[in-house]
Interface confidence: low
């Protein structure tokens, strides 16, 4: 089941998935001046069996200049109204899949891909938040959001994160347009236990996104 909307936004923060649940789709988007090859996939799909998950299809981009036709716009499958956008992180170390059956690693880059990746998440997906450069977190530990199905509707749980400017002492940030929404104590349903290897501090996560998925205690 696809999640109906985007993960919540948080002022001055970005989110990132460490691994992608089976059923997740990634749009095959090309950078400016390039387009999907005519017979190419619209999206990559995380599929798998009980022991192994991987991305089906391969995105391929080709130079727009090689054809005299108008630029091709990637059509969206009809049911995918909402677009989940994450900026490319590079270099990227995928999470250890041994600890997360039923999940795909971050797909490897393809030639001439767009600078942003647009994912279509499924129920059960967890994403992790970090403050953008120049801001620090006013909370301890991870901030995550999980796409859950409640009463037949999908929704993302609320991450616990407030990001404040490092130099600010008396004024709370917010005068400039935030990049991203709500914060607070995670709701009880966010106590989603996922096996963990090692959780560094969030600033390290922001630097390399190499952190493994971690167990979260509902506080």
């Amino acid at each position: 089941e696809l999640c109906d909307d985007d993960p919540p936004e948080i002022p001055h923060a970005t989110f990132k998935a460490m691994a992608y649940k089976e059923g997740t789709m990634l749009n095959c988007e090309c950078k400016r001046g390039f387009r999907r090859i005519k017979s190419g996939s619209l999206y990559m799909l995380c599929t798998g069996n009980s022991s192994h998950s991987s991305w089906d299809n391969q995105c391929q981009c080709t130079s727009s200049a090689t054809r005299n036709t108008t630029k091709q716009v990637t059509p969206q499958p009809e049911e995918q109204k909402e677009r989940k956008t994450t900026e490319m992180q590079s270099p990227m170390q995928p999470v250890d899949q041994a600890s997360l059956p039923g999940h795909c690693r971050e797909p490897p880059p393809w030639e001439n891909e767009a600078t942003e990746r647009i994912y279509h998440f499924v129920v059960g997906q967890m994403v992790y938040y970090q403050c953008v450069q120049g801001y620090r977190a006013l909370h301890r530990g991870p901030a995550e959001s999980v796409c859950k199905m409640t009463h037949g509707k999908t929704r993302w749980t609320q991450p616990q994160l407030i990001c404040t400017g490092e130099m600010e002492t008396s004024q709370f940030p917010g005068e400039e347009k935030p990049q991203a929404s709500p914060e607070g104590r995670p709701e009880s349903e966010t106590s989603c236990l996922v096996t963990t290897t090692d959780f560094q501090i969030q600033t390290e996560m922001a630097a390399t996104m190499e952190t493994s998925i971690f167990t979260t205690e509902y506080q």
């Epitope: 002022p11 404040t164 005068e175």
Partner: antibody
């Protein structure tokens, strides 16, 4: 079950001080930002002060800046609001709340009356 | 500070009615908006966060929408237990600020 229980309210004369406490249970207090919100009788709500999980960052509304001090004791899972130089316009029910801007959990509130 | 103006300040409606409450910011609040319900003698409780996300445990008859400076709380079918005062609150800029409230009563 999350519980926030405020105490320390009552009647106080203008210019005097009062300290409110909020005892928290049901979640790991030291991991979460906290705030005080107040509501004057028959009036709206206003955010008074905010404190980060570790107490390093505090924010105040302008009208209380320099008079009120928010603090916390993570070992005791208690939030405080020290109110000095109290004014009649500080008369209100004071609520402690979790989660910074979200106000997800609230205490039952404690009444502070500033009057001579 | 960002001023949040709610309308109407008082609302009377019948059980089963669709009710809408409006909230307007003095400047763009970027969808960083919560809605609270406060019953007489009780602390507020949050219904909606981030403009349109329903708080866990809140009935689905409550919904939120809006963007920029204009936001709406909708109760799709009013129930007797919905009698309360409703507040919006922005959190895009400190100090976070509430609207003046909308008192909802039954006809």
């Amino acid at each position: 079950e999350v519980q926030l229980v405020e105490s320390g309210g009552g009647l106080v004369q203008p210019g005097r001080s009062m300290k409110l406490s909020c005892a928290v249970s049901g979640f790991t207090f030291s991991n979460h930002a906290m705030a005080w919100v107040r509501q004057a009788p028959k009036k709206g709500l206003e955010w008074v002060a905010y404190i980060s999980y570790d107490g390093d960052n505090t924010y105040y509304r302008d009208s209380v800046k320099g008079r009120f001090t928010i603090s916390r004791d993570n070992a005791q899972s208690t939030l405080y609001l020290q109110m000095d130089s109290l004014r009649s316009e500080d008369t209100a029910t004071y609520y402690c709340t979790t989660g910074g801007n979200s106000g997800y959990d609230w205490g039952q509130g404690v009444m502070v009356t500033v009057s001579s | 500070d960002i001023q949040m103006t709610q309308s109407p300040s008082f609302l009377s409606a019948s059980v089963g009615d669709r009710v809408t409450i409006n909230c307007k910011g003095s400047q763009n609040v970027n969808k960083f908006l919560n809605w609270y319900q406060q019953k007489l003698g009780e602390a507020p409780r949050r219904l909606i966060y981030g403009t349109n996300s329903l708080q866990t445990g809140i009935p689905s008859r409550f919904s939120g929408s809006g963007s920029g400076t204009d936001y709406t709380l909708t109760i799709s079918s009013l129930q007797p237990e919905d009698v309360a005062t409703y507040f919006c609150q922005q959190y895009t800029s400190w100090p976070w600020t509430f609207g003046g409230g909308t008192k909802l009563e039954l006809k």
